[in-house]
């Protein structure tokens, strides 16, 4: 009888993660008596995957009827494949003895595992930035195999070109990770904008994965201020408004100053939203000019999103208005309905 040969017909097998891998092996003879074993890798550090003789291998099943001696098919199925299972598998015939001795090995079957990348996670800068500044976004995806992968960046559907991408590790590995950093120039219209990281991989069958970041989390559009004096509403009363326009985010505190002294502080509440996602707000001040002997410098001071305050002033001329006898400064008039300065917002 011819000497036993161990035949592994497949040089390589590719399996999607989570599926089962079938590794084929047949022998050409019933002798010598002794077990078949499967190993991953070669040499002294090889890992035992299945031993016909003994042991518990919950993920491994024999493909053929192993209770018949005439069976020469020692193919195995490994369930629930993960990237960690990748490697070269050897079917090895042993001769019975004490110890069992390796008689002949198959040529090996390389198992590669196709693993999907994780959903891309896009993260922006830790602090907000203002228009005209360049900010960096990172995109990460992990656990994919094989190594080949394509990553693209988009801003509102327009592909970006200023980015750098790395796939790690550089050498052979059971699975890989991708890390990319894109640079984006902010504009005032970016409150509604999105940055998208798109990952394409063989396992995704042409349906790429996307991760998004809203620029609303990143951008700060500082407000523009305009202080105007409205026509006199009543004798000796002037309405002064502070228009706070085109700001984002909404977090804003406004303080009125009268000749440098705090008159009133309020927080933006009933704002109006512009089409571009920025906000407008208006605060008004009703000034009783008869309470003032001299001109009044009214300042609208705005602190937006924790940034240093910006302000706009308006000089209110009182010389043209006749003064009431016995009148005092605004600070000295305390009558509840006789306030010299009234305020409101809208």
């Amino acid at each position: 009888e011819e000497e036993l040969q161990v035949i592994q017909p497949d040089k390589s097998v590719s399996v999607a993660a989570g599926e089962s891998a079938i590794l084929h092996c047949t022998v050409t003879s019933l002798i010598p008596v002794g077990p078949i074993q499967w190993f991953r890798g070669a040499g002294p550090a090889r890992e035992l995957i299945y031993n016909q003789k003994e042991g518990h291998f919950p993920r491994v099943t024999t493909v053929s009827e192993s209770t018949k001696r005439e069976n020469m098919d020692f193919s195995i199925s490994i369930s629930n494949i993960t990237p960690a299972d990748a490697g070269t598998y050897y079917c090895v015939k042993f001769r019975k003895g004490s110890p069992d001795t390796e008689f002949k090995s198959g040529a090996g079957t390389e198992l590669s595992v196709r693993a999907k990348p994780s959903a891309p996670v896009v993260s922006g800068p830790a602090a907000r930035a203002t228009p005209q500044h360049t900010v960096s976004f990172t995109c990460e995806s992990h656990g994919f195999s094989p190594r080949d992968i394509t990553l693209k960046w988009f801003k509102n559907g327009n592909e970006l070109s200023d980015f750098q991408t790395n796939v790690d590790p550089v050498g052979e590995s059971v699975s890989y990770s991708i890390h990319s950093t894109a640079k984006v120039v902010l504009t005032r219209e970016d409150v509604h904008s999105q940055v998208i990281c798109e990952v394409a991989h063989v396992t995704l069958q042409g349906d790429p994965l996307r991760g998004t970041a809203n620029l609303s989390e990143t951008i700060r559009v500082p407000p523009t201020l305009e202080v105007t004096q409205q026509p006199v509403r009543a004798e000796n009363q002037v309405n002064v408004t502070c228009q706070v326009r085109k700001f984002y985010p909404q977090r804003l505190q406004l303080t009125w100053l009268e000749n440098g002294n705090v008159s009133r502080t309020e927080t933006a509440s009933t704002v109006t939203e512009n089409k571009d996602g920025t906000y407008n707000w208006m605060s008004w001040l009703l000034v009783n000019v008869s309470a003032h002997r001299d001109d009044v410098k009214l300042t609208c001071q705005v602190e937006h999103d924790g940034q240093p305050a910006v302000s706009k002033s308006h000089d209110l001329k009182v010389s043209a208005h006749p003064k009431e006898q016995g009148s005092n400064t605004a600070a000295e008039n305390t009558g509840s309905n006789e306030r010299n300065i009234y305020g409101g917002s809208g």
Epitope: L30, V33, S98
Partner: antibody
Framework: EVQLVESGGGLVQPGGSLRLSCAAS????????MHWVRQATGKGLEWVSA???????YYTGSVKGRFTISRENAKNSLYLQMNSLRASDTAVYYC????????????WGQGTMVTVSS | DIQMTQSPSSLSASVGDRVTITCRAS??????LAWFQQKPGKAPKSLIY???SLHSGVPSKFSGSGSGTDFTLTISSLQPEDFATYYC?????????FGQGTKLEIK
Amino acid sequence: EVQLVESGGGLVQPGGSLRLSCAASGFTLSSYDMHWVRQATGKGLEWVSAIGTAGDTYYTGSVKGRFTISRENAKNSLYLQMNSLRASDTAVYYCVRGGVWDDAFDIWGQGTMVTVSS
Amino acid sequence: DIQMTQSPSSLSASVGDRVTITCRASQDINNYLAWFQQKPGKAPKSLIYTASSLHSGVPSKFSGSGSGTDFTLTISSLQPEDFATYYCQQYVSYPYTFGQGTKLEIK
């Protein structure tokens, strides 16, 4: 059903011959190592002989040169030709199938009695 | 030849008992050790192979262990049908050899 049935036992005089047969059913006998095991009355088990799938044969020391194991694939049968029989060969002879990959005994026949006596 | 020594030669036990029979080989036999059960007037029945693997249909109350030269057969809870003679056997190399047997009797 996997089964082994021995036949051919009986009473024989010392120095005589006897041929034991074992008919296999439910499996292909030629694919397995096959064995003969004997047991003298009130004694333990003793392995006697084996034939491998390649036709290689093995014997215990006390029967070497006197016993011959063989098989006939067409009849799916195993044989033990016993010559120069001695009183010490008196025993029940069992036909046994070796296991799938390690030759561990798995299937036993019911046995046939061989008595060597004058 | 490899000698197989069983102990004890006989053993008395009661229904429900847990019993252990040992078998020692005169040299290393890896784990190519089998256990058989034989009742009077019957052919032996294969219980265990490769020291610890149960043959098909053998109840799990039978268990085997060991490797090298020292082996044990344990019956976890004796039932009336378990009273019989038990044999160990090495089958690592020819000539295959059996232990002398352990007769398990009802106390």
